[in-house]
Interface confidence: medium
């Protein structure tokens, strides 16, 4: 049988007198009304048992027959109260009631767990009229039960504004355990306890849980669901799953990987994106994160010059966006660059070192000891200087730029001279007499023009003056030099 009725139910005659004892008899109902979309009833209905006490609602009709005999109270006949069956099986159950023919338009509705069942349910109402009463059988069938069909089903009928309610029929759908909570993958710190949770439900209950670690059971003794497994810490990756067992069989959860957090792998593919005289833009591909998010990275820079003191510059940066501009570098210099990143566990090893070079830059300092003096015999201004220190030239000197500004009685004009890198002196023609000449000099490389020296001023008198002392760059802290003749 499809239904597993856990209470004994003998096949009492369904109705007294002429009513059919079962749907298998030759009585043909006068009317068969599908409740909705006409699914075929799959199975037999459960037997009813008249004469048993009834707890459903009862309607007492006030109308009497021609002989003035009071009608008996109206109530649904008893049927099986509890049906237990396996998932995907079919089931059919019914409510039946005998209604005096004086009542018209009686309809039966099905309710599950307090809500009316509307729409495409497999519900059929059949009417068996007789001289005085009509037997009404309301059948409800489900062709392939699911867990969601579990619940308490009742019939309701309205007569004279009275509601007649049947006893409930409890449907219990049994099957393999169904997981409501499965273990989840985690990244855990080595040797640190953590919990895994597994919960499964029937029916049938109870559901017992077995834990499996790397294909071996952790517990040979099952725990009732729900189960929380406290793992006392791992030293290596493990796969956990749980088995849920009930009387119908077992269901195995998904296997989840528990990873052990570790230091990251070193970054790879460190590459140079751009170089300037004093900075290098690098990028890298992060290594494996060790199952713990990267926090930050460290860029290590050391001079590749074998004569350097080997000191390492360290620049810290955020882990994203795997890009960093290293600044404050010397121009035209070679560097070894490595990258290391960290997570909560610790620092990775340093990436493979790469070589990078800065380009030529404009000199970072001006020529030193600039002196200016007037050579009246040739009507020239002689300029002398010392070239900047090699380290601060930031490239190969290609020459110098001389700025000389002539100021006289409200007139001012600036002239620029370019001179070659050889030597450290220049001569410029006097442009204006009775004027002040202000001279500044900058060193020039292919990388650009460096800063100009502090201005040196010399007064150029009218013709006929003699004996001129030179004007020179002042010592630090002195005011601009002005040679007054």
């Amino acid at each position: 049988a499809i239904t597993e009725a856990r209470e004994e139910a003998k096949p009492y005659p369904l109705f007294p007198g002429p009513f059919p004892g079962s749907l298998q008899t030759d009585h043909t109902p006068l009317l068969s009304l599908p409740h909705a979309s006409g699914y075929q009833p799959a199975l037999m209905f459960s037997p009813t048992q008249p004469g048993r006490p009834h707890t459903g609602n009862v309607a007492i009709p006030q109308v009497t027959s021609v002989e003035s005999k009071p009608l008996p109270p109206l109530a649904f006949k008893h049927t099986v109260g509890h049906i237990i069956l396996s998932e995907h099986k079919g089931v059919k159950f019914n409510c039946s009631i005998s209604v005096p023919n004086i009542y018209q338009d009686t309809t039966i509705s099905w309710w599950k767990d307090g809500k009316e069942l509307l729409g495409a349910h497999h519900a059929i109402t059949q009417f068996y009229p007789d001289d005085e009463v009509t037997a009404i059988i309301a059948s409800f069938s489900i062709t392939s039960v699911q867990r969601s069909d579990n619940g308490s089903y009742i019939c309701k009928m309205k007569i004279n504004n009275e509601e007649i309610v049947s006893d409930p029929i409890y449907i219990e759908v049994q099957g393999l355990p169904h997981f409501t909570k499965q273990p989840e993958s985690m990244n855990v710190t080595r040797n640190t306890a953590f919990n895994l949770t597994c919960q499964a439900v029937g029916p049938p209950e109870p559901v017992n849980i077995f834990w499996v670690q790397n294909s071996s059971r952790v517990n040979e003794q099952p725990e009732k669901s729900p189960s929380v497994l406290t793992v006392p810490g791992l030293t290596e990756m493990a796969v956990f799953s749980c088995e849920a067992h009930n009387d119908k069989g077992l269901t195995v959860s998904k296997g989840v990987q528990i990873n052990i957090k570790a230091i990251p792998s070193p970054p790879t593919e460190v590459s140079i994106r751009n170089s300037t005289a004093h900075s290098i833009l690098i990028s890298w591909v992060p290594g494996f994160d060790g199952y713990s998010p990267f926090r930050n990275c460290s860029i290590q820079v050391k001079e590749a010059d074998p004569l350097s003191n080997g000191s390492v510059m360290i620049f810290n940066t955020s882990a994203l966006p795997h890009l960093y501009q290293i600044k404050q570098l010397q121009a035209l210099a070679n560097y070894s660059i490595g990258v290391s990143c960290m997570n909560e566990i610790g620092w990775s090893a340093v990436s493979p070192w790469i070589l990078a070079s800065t380009t030529e830059g404009a000199p970072s300092v001006a020529p030193l000891n600039v002196t200016v003096f007037l050579n009246e015999s040739s009507d020239n201004v002689d300029i002398r200087w010392m070239k900047p220190p090699t380290k601060q030239q930031d490239g190969e000197l290609v020459g110098y730029r001389i700025s000389h500004v002539w100021q006289s009685a409200g007139i001012s004009k600036e002239l620029l001279e370019e001179v070659g890198q050889n030597g450290s002196r220049a001569r410029i023609s006097v442009q204006v007499h009775n004027a002040t000449c202000t001279v500044r000099i900058a060193a020039v490389t292919r990388g650009g023009v460096g800063p100009f020296s502090d201005p040196v001023k010399i007064f150029i008198p009218a013709h006929g003056w003699v004996d001129y002392a030179p004007s020179s760059t002042p010592a630090p802290g002195n005011a601009d030099p002005v040679l007054i003749i």
């Epitope: 071996s216 059971r217 040979e220 003794q221 791992l234 030293t235 290596e236």
Partner: antibody
Framework: QIQLVQSGPELKKPGETVKISCKAS????????MSWVHQAPGKGLKWLGW????????TYADDFRGRFAFSLDTSVSTASLEINNLQNEDTATYFC???????????WGQGTLVTVST | QIVLSQSPAILSASPGEKVTMTCRAT?????MHWYQRKPGSSPKPWIY???NLASGVPARFSGSGSGTSYSLTISRVEAEDAATYYC?????????FGGGTKLEIK
């Protein structure tokens, strides 16, 4: 009460085979794994491996792969250990032990002394 | 595999003394179990999962530890405690035992 009763002592020659049994009672045999442990004279305890009494799958420690075999007869709640090609160094007392959560050996057999001697 | 080293190998104590024996693992383990073995009998389960006393074990015994270092302590030694005590780990296969600490009562 829970008991693990092992078969009696065995005297064997090198190259022979011995089979030790361990009969469990007082609990559901297939609900707990069964481990095998031995102790050579003057030495400590050493774990040979275990058998899953639910599935019948054995697991062997590295030192005991090959000549050692675990088996079950669940109909009589018995686990067995068979050692082939016995060697002198197999002389030891062999214990079966019921394995609870986290390999806790909660119940032990009384031990079976296997002596291998020419 | 994880190797367990027990120390001392032999421990001599007078009744009433407090004694501690240690079990060190070559790498960190999750749980440490302890067993008592007397000559002529099988090992008895003694302390489960680091610190839980097995049924019938006197309360003067206690277990503690974490990581790679575990210990079994007897607060007041009695004559019946004379035995060899073995530690055993479950954190990775194979299950391994320590070499044992033999407790002698003076």
């Amino acid at each position: 009460q829970i008991q693990l009763v092992q078969s009696g002592p065995e005297l064997k020659k090198p190259g022979e085979t011995v089979k030790i049994s361990c009969k469990a009672s007082g609990y559901t045999f297939t609900s707990y794994g069964m481990s095998w442990v031995h102790q050579a004279p003057g030495k400590g305890l050493k774990w040979l491996g275990w058998i899953n009494t639910y599935s019948g799958v054995p697991t062997y420690a590295d030192d005991f792969r090959g000549r050692f075999a675990f088996s079950l007869d669940t109909s009589v709640s018995t686990a067995s250990l068979e050692i082939n090609n016995l060697q002198n160094e197999d002389t030891a007392t062999y214990f079966c032990a019921r394995e609870d959560n986290w390999a806790w050996f909660a119940y032990w057999g009384q031990g079976t002394l296997v002596t291998v001697s020419t | 595999q994880i190797v367990l080293s027990q120390s001392p190998a032999i421990l001599s104590a007078s009744p009433g003394e407090k004694v501690t024996m240690t079990c060190r693992a070559t790498s960190s383990v999750g749980y440490m179990h302890w067993y008592q073995r007397k000559p002529g009998s099988s090992p008895k389960p003694w302390i489960y999962a680091t610190s839980n006393l097995a049924s019938g074990v006197p309360a003067r015994f206690s277990g503690s530890g974490s990581g790679t270092s575990y210990s079994l302590t007897i607060s007041r030694v009695e004559a019946e405690d004379a035995a060899t005590y073995y530690c055993q780990q479950w954190s990775s296969n194979p299950r391994t035992f320590g070499g044992g600490t033999k407790l002698e009562i003076k």
